[in-house]
């Protein structure tokens, strides 16, 4: 089978500052030199793109300047960080990997990581 398998953790809890990190790992059926990684969010049956980056193997992963994602790559493993998350952003985040070059193209879609985000409690006023 020449399909590409993508693995990601089932559950991640965001930090109190609204930052969530997880690893997306893919088993490449070919020797890709150019890879695109996309984070998708699935809510109900709607899928939206959170962020995307294309990188050359051996080089760093670069998201757009205004992206809420950052990441690093090492071999067939991508370490993804999503920032600025709030409780309403809790949901299933899917890692999608595409081997862009050289041909043939391959698509890999993970099962998704459920990211839980809890808004921090406001600090109570303190009287001294």
């Amino acid at each position: 089978c020449k399909a590409m398998h993508v693995a990601q953790p089932a559950v991640v809890l965001a930090s109190s500052r609204g930052i969530a990190s997880f690893v997306c790992e893919y088993a490449s059926p070919g020797k890709a030199t150019e890879v695109r990684v996309t984070v998708l969010r699935q809510a109900d049956s709607q899928v939206t793109e959170v962020c995307a980056a294309t990188y050359m193997m051996g080089n760093e992963l670069t998201f757009l300047d205004d992206s809420i994602c950052t990441g690093t790559s090492s071999g067939n493993q991508v370490n993804l960080t999503i920032q600025g998350l709030r409780a309403m952003d809790t949901g299933l985040y899917i890692c999608k990997v595409e081997l862009m070059y050289p041909p043939p193209y391959y698509l890999g879609i993970g099962n998704g990581t459920q990211i839980y985000v809890i808004d921090p409690e406001p600090c109570p006023d303190s009287d001294f």
Epitope: C1, A3, H5, A52, Y106, I109
Partner: antibody
Framework: QVQLVESGGGVVQPGRSLRLSCAAS????????MHWVRQAPGKGLEWVAV????????HYADSVKGRFTISRDNSKNTLYLQMNSLRAEDTAVYYC???????????WGQGTMVTVSS | EIVLTQSPGTLSLSPGERATLSCRAS???????LAWYQQKPGQAPRLLIY???SRATGIPDRFSGSGSGTDFTLTISRLEPEDFAVYYC?????????FGPGTKVDIK
């Protein structure tokens, strides 16, 4: 709403060229791969070519490799198919289709007919 | 190249009946990358099912998909008059993207 509209089809002689266009609206064009799929009269669907995102990566079916060129202009939200050295067997309805975020072809144009005949 | 074959070529049924369409791949296809499309005469194809079993937006629940490996099935639980059409399976996990030859569902 999300829409794809093809144009540029017509009748052309064997060996000649034709350029098809596909105007996209209602979505962020640059965020999607775009395909051309064709259907010969009374036949099934045949994938022709795909162009990804910024246009730097393209893949073609063997039947059109070296003759057809797919391109896109993200500033104009338009997809193109330049068809050279046309043959009778290229006669078909040509559809443009959006590569959905999950991979399947989720939006299709209405198609444009190309007839290669002397 | 992954070759897809569909059976039967034509399925003659009456409204209200159950339709079962088969798609077989020449090599294993991950179920994540198998789709079904419906096409009516003079119209463009329409995505019904992706990921072998997930319904596309706006597709009624009488359409369902199943299968894994090399064998996939599209089931229409109760045929409505508007369901008589040609159905294609497709793999989109690797290029070249390939379609099956189609199954025509017509009125008995």
């Amino acid at each position: 709403q999300v829409q794809l509209v093809e144009s540029g089809g017509g009748v052309v002689q064997p060996g000649r060229s034709l350029r098809l266009s596909c105007a996209a609206s209602g979505f962020t064009f640059r965020s999607y791969g775009m395909h051309w799929v064709r259907q010969a009269p009374g036949k099934g669907l045949e994938w022709v070519a795909v162009i990804w995102y910024d246009g730097s990566n393209k893949h073609y079916a063997d039947s059109v490799k070296g003759r057809f060129t797919i391109s896109r202009d993200n500033s104009k939200n338009t997809l193109y198919l330049q068809m050279n050295s046309l043959r009778a067997e290229d006669t078909a309805v040509y559809y443009c289709a959006r590569n959905g975020l999950i991979g399947a072809f989720d939006i299709w144009g209405q198609g444009t007919m190309v007839t290669v005949s002397s | 190249e992954i070759v897809l074959t569909q059976s039967p070529g034509t399925l003659s049924l009456s409204p209200g009946e159950r339709a079962t369409l088969s798609c077989r791949a020449s090599q294993s296809v991950s179920s994540s990358y198998l789709a079904w499309y419906q096409q009516k005469p003079g119209q463009a194809p329409r995505l019904l099912i992706y990921g072998a079993s997930s319904r596309a937006t706006g597709i009624p629940d009488r359409f369902s998909g199943s299968g894994s490996g090399t064998d996939f099935t599209l089931t229409i639980s109760r045929l409505e008059p508007e369901d008589f059409a040609v159905y294609y399976c497709q793999q989109y996990g690797s290029s070249p993207f390939t379609f099956g030859p189609g199954t025509k569902v017509d009125i008995k």
